[in-house]
């Protein structure tokens, strides 16, 4: 007969998993804040910039109290997938001006990807229903000009910063309910 079966696999403490997700999110938040500041120094923003293809902010800070874990993680994952796509697009189509933000933009993309994988893992460990596969998103049109790429970068980093700030608050609040 084969080797004796190993001990039953104990699922890690979900609070520890959530802690690890909070740490990654907070680290990415600080990176994003710094990169957005770097962008403002290199290319000062003339007012607020928006990009229609970006997700709307998931939740105001005041509404955090009503959050439920499955909803938060599902929405956060969807929003971060959108931001990952936008960062990839920015690096590919943003133009030569934005090359000055490398390698930081590449590091941001890698950490965003890592956070998404961590969220996926957390959802499976918590036995949450897995979201359906993402429908293929329509391709993002290249910026109309170099300045268009810079405006897009301001919008993407600003939106990502707000989303991650919301995520840290939400995840910490949810941790108290586990």
């Amino acid at each position: 007969p084969g080797p004796p079966p190993g001990p039953p696999r104990v699922s890690p403490d979900p609070r520890a998993e959530l802690d690890s997700t909070v740490l990654l999110t907070r680290s990415l938040l600080a990176d994003t804040r710094q990169l957005a500041a770097q962008l403002r120094d290199k290319f000062p923003a003339d007012g607020d910039h928006n990009l229609d293809s970006l997700p709307t902010l998931a939740m105001s800070a005041g509404a955090l109290g009503a959050l439920q874990l499955p909803g938060v993680l599902t929405r956060l994952r969807a929003d971060l997938l959108s931001y990952l796509r936008h960062v990839q697009w920015l690096r590919r189509a943003g133009g030569s001006s934005l090359k000055t933000l490398e390698p930081e933009l590449g590091t941001l993309q890698a950490r965003l990807d890592r956070l998404l994988r961590r969220l996926q893992l957390l959802m499976s460990r918590l036995a949450l229903p897995q979201p359906p596969p993402d429908p293929p998103a329509p391709p993002l049109a290249p910026p109309s000009s170099a300045w268009g790429g810079i405006r897009a970068a301001h919008a993407i980093l600003g939106g990502l910063h707000l989303t991650l700030d919301w995520a840290v608050r939400g995840l910490l609040l949810l941790k108290t309910r586990l």
Epitope: L23, R26, A30, A36, D41
Partner: antibody, heavy 120, light 108 residues
Framework: EVQLVESGGGLVQPGGSLRLSCAAS????????MHWVRQAPGKGLEWVAY????????YYADTVKGRFTISRDNAKNSLYLQMNSLRAEDTAVYYC?????????????WGQGTLVTVSS | EIVLTQSPATLSLSPGERATLSCSVS???????LHWYQQKPGQAPRLLIY???NLASGIPARFSGSGSGTDFTLTISSLEPEDFAVYYC?????????FGQGTKLEIK
């Protein structure tokens, strides 16, 4: 050798104003974010304000927001702190500090400090 | 705001002994944003350890840092007379950047 030298401290009445300066040398000033940190007599350290290399992002502690203004002149290798509406609790030694090489590596270089006393 | 609480407030030890200083953080923070400083009377603070465990330039190897999440430690393996000072931890992940209240390391 990195050097930071603060000046401009002194005795000022409550409600008054003061402008601190920090002269930087020994490094490319325009490449680094800069901070002001203060220390009340016999107390601990308190972060006051931060400015990015190009001055386009600025952060303040809540205790000074709306009263203090951080600025810099890269051509003069100088950092400033304009302090208005001063209160007794602003009495402290004020240090300028430079981040290490990356923003997440702490305050690696400090000046010797300049004492601000707010008293009537 | 993230609050850092240092313990003990005062630590009385003799030269040659091992010192262990603690910094407890109110929120989870990534270790790369936790730093330690030393300050002697009448002097500016000096960066000792950055990113929780990296020795700053010119700092002797008897100093070391460790920890993660909410609990961080500064260790001095064998105290030298010049190590008696006040030690501060500081977080740089969130604005406002904050310091602990300090631990005074005094000669027993």
């Amino acid at each position: 050798e990195v050097q930071l030298v603060e000046s401009g401290g002194g005795l000022v009445q409550p409600g008054g104003s003061l402008r601190l300066s920090c002269a930087a040398s020994g490094f490319t000033f325009s490449s680094f974010g800069m901070h002001w940190v203060r220390q009340a007599p016999g107390k601990g350290l308190e972060w006051v304000a931060y400015i990015t290399p190009g001055s386009n992002t600025i952060y303040y502690a809540d205790t000074v927001k709306g009263r203090f203004t951080i600025s810099r002149d890269n051509a003069k290798n100088s950092l400033y702190l304009q302090m208005n509406s001063l209160r007794a609790e602003d009495t402290a030694v004020y240090y300028c500090a430079r981040e290490y090489y990356s923003y997440d590596e702490g305050f690696a270089y400090w000046g010797q400090g300049t004492l601000v006393t707010v008293s009537s | 705001e993230i609050v850092l609480t240092q313990s003990p407030a005062t630590l009385s030890l003799s030269p040659g002994e091992r010192a262990t200083l603690s910094c407890s953080v109110s929120d989870l923070i990534p270790s790369q944003y936790l730093h330690w400083y030393q300050q002697k009377p009448g002097q500016a603070p000096r960066l000792l350890i950055y990113r929780a465990s990296n020795l700053a330039s010119g700092i002797p190897a008897r100093f070391s840092g460790s920890g993660s999440g909410t609990d961080f430690t500064l260790t001095i393996s064998s105290l030298e007379p010049e190590d008696f000072a006040v030690y501060y931890c500081q977080q740089g992940v969130d604005v406002p950047f904050t310091f602990g209240q300090g631990t005074k390391l005094e000669i027993k």
